[in-house]
């Protein structure tokens, strides 16, 4: 969590933005918030990003105003307009590129005063694992599938039954580049399951983890899955 | 307890239509994989198809592939086998099964119904 | 298809004796080999997985052992309710999964 605050000149006010990860080819949101003003027309919204020379996105007097945008921008950003007079100035990012990571500030000004916070977004891909028993293999056999993740992650396997047991030497993980070239889908397999247990395929890398978790008895067989976004500092 | 209970068979013409129902209890049917599995007058058993545990997977044999559709609905906890073209070689006792959970082999069958194709 | 080959196609035993009944693939199959049992008019009943794992409630007397494409099915002391139709099934390589033609387990 950045918490920013006005620079002299008016009265400063409390702008804060919450470090996100964007999933690319997906829309992903900036998050910030900052005190409300009652007049709409006097607020003003200004999201630049380090390293770019124009602006991101600007909301002035009730609606975008764009003339300034970056090329690479053109497009893709909204703010949601309706929840900006009660201090909503989150940014609507479509179509997430790889390049869209950096450093991002949301500046703010109202009739109270002026403030800012800075907002660190990265990108990359990540997915919901689903695990199944691969009753095609030679063996007891579960496969774990997760679709799109980047940069290449991790995958660790672990038992409810076996707990604290390395199942590196009893599992494979391969890695295979999906059509649009960045992007992988995670596939790995584990072998010699047994029955009455319950395994998990954790997947990781710097921006998300993912758990996919399979219950295998002989009258039951449940999956569940799911992904948390690692690095979500608000400040 | 688990229990598979199979009905709609009966004595049909050949060329015709005829769909057999699995009702299944006693366990969490939506996890599993289903089968048929028959038996001709006097031989031995023959699989003939299984589907996925959430439908999106099909198999058959060869001698019925084309023919027939097995089908489920999670919802009502029921197997088919829709067997159209039937044919005078399609009369059995048709059995469903339950796939194991981590291997196709057969812990559970129903008691079968048959099935009669003749003129 | 892998081809599952039961031999004998008949056992006559006597009651107390014990039956030995065979199964071979035609390719390997690793340990995924069932063995069940059918009498007249009833459904088949799973007695063996993995090639040698007992299923749920089934007696110590049934046992099977074999690896790769030859299996093996004894039956240490014959119990009248023994005597019924033995059949393999193959669940390594599918589709098809396939079963043995079965061997009937007589009184001598």
């Known amino acids: 969590l950045i918490i920013g605050f006005g620079i002299s000149g008016r009265h400063s006010i409390t702008v804060t933005t919450v470090a996100s990860a964007g999933n690319i080819g997906e829309d992903g949101i900036l998050s910030c918030t900052f005190e409300p003003d009652i007049k709409l027309s006097d607020i003003v919204i200004q999201w630049l990003k380090e390293g770019v020379i124009g602006l991101v996105h600007e909301f002035k007097e009730g609606k975008d105003e764009l003339s300034e945008q970056d090329e690479m921008f053109r497009g893709r950003t909204a703010v949601f307009a309706d929840q900006v007079i009660v201090g909503n100035a989150s940014l609507r990012l479509k179509n997430v590129q790889l390049t869209d990571a950096g450093t991002y500030k949301c500046y703010i000004i109202t009739s109270k005063g002026k403030g800012n916070a800075n907002l660190e977004y990265k990108t990359g891909a990540f997915s919901m694992p689903e695990v199944n028993v691969d009753y095609n293999a030679s063996s007891e056999t579960l496969r774990c599938e997760a679709p799109r993740w980047f940069p290449q992650p991790t995958v660790v396997w672990a038992s409810q039954v076996d707990q604290g047991a390395n199942f590196s030497e009893v599992s494979n993980t391969s890695f295979e580049l999906n059509s649009e070239n960045v992007t992988m889908k995670v596939v790995s397999v584990l072998y010699n399951v047994t029955i009455n247990n319950t395994y998990s395929c954790m997947i990781e890398n710097d921006i998300a983890k993912a758990t996919g978790d399979i219950k295998v008895t002989e009258s039951e067989i449940k999956r569940r899955s799911h992904l948390q976004l690692l690095n979500s500092k608000a400040s | 307890q688990v229990q598979l209970v199979e009905s709609g068979g009966g004595v049909v013409q050949p060329g015709r239509s005829l769909r057999l129902s699995c009702a299944a209890s006693?366990?969490?049917?939506?996890?599993?994989?289903m089968h048929w599995v028959r038996q001709a007058p006097g031989k031995g058993l023959e699989w003939v198809a299984v589907?996925?545990?959430?439908?999106?997977?099909?198999y058959y044999a060869d001698s019925v592939k084309g023919r027939f559709i097995i089908s489920r609905d999670n919802s009502k906890d029921t197997l088919y086998l829709q067997m159209n073209s039937l044919r005078a070689g399609d009369t059995a006792v048709y059995y469903c099964a339950k796939g194991g959970a981590l291997r196709w082999y057969f812990a559970y069958w129903g008691q079968g119904t048959l099935v009669t194709v003749s003129s | 298809e892998i081809v599952m080959t039961q031999s004998p196609a008949t056992l006559s035993v006597s009651p107390g004796e014990r039956a030995t009944l065979s199964c071979r693939a035609s390719?390997?199959?690793?340990?995924?080999l069932g063995w069940y049992q059918q009498k007249p008019g009833q459904a088949p009943r799973l007695l063996i997985y993995?090639?040698?794992t007992r299923a749920t409630g089934i007696p110590a007397r049934f046992s099977g052992s074999g690896s790769g494409t030859e299996f093996t099915l004894t039956i240490s002391s014959l119990q009248s309710e023994d005597f019924a139709v033995y059949y393999c099934?193959?669940?390594?390589?599918?589709?098809?999964?396939?079963f043995g033609g079965g061997t009937k387990v007589e009184i001598k």
């Open positions: 390719q390997s199959i690793s340990s995924n």
């Open positions: 006693g366990f969490t049917f939506r996890s599993f994989g």
């Open positions: 993995g090639a040698s």
């Open positions: 099934q193959q669940y390594r390589s599918w589709p098809p999964l396939t």
């Open positions: 589907i996925s545990y959430d439908a999106s997977n099909e």
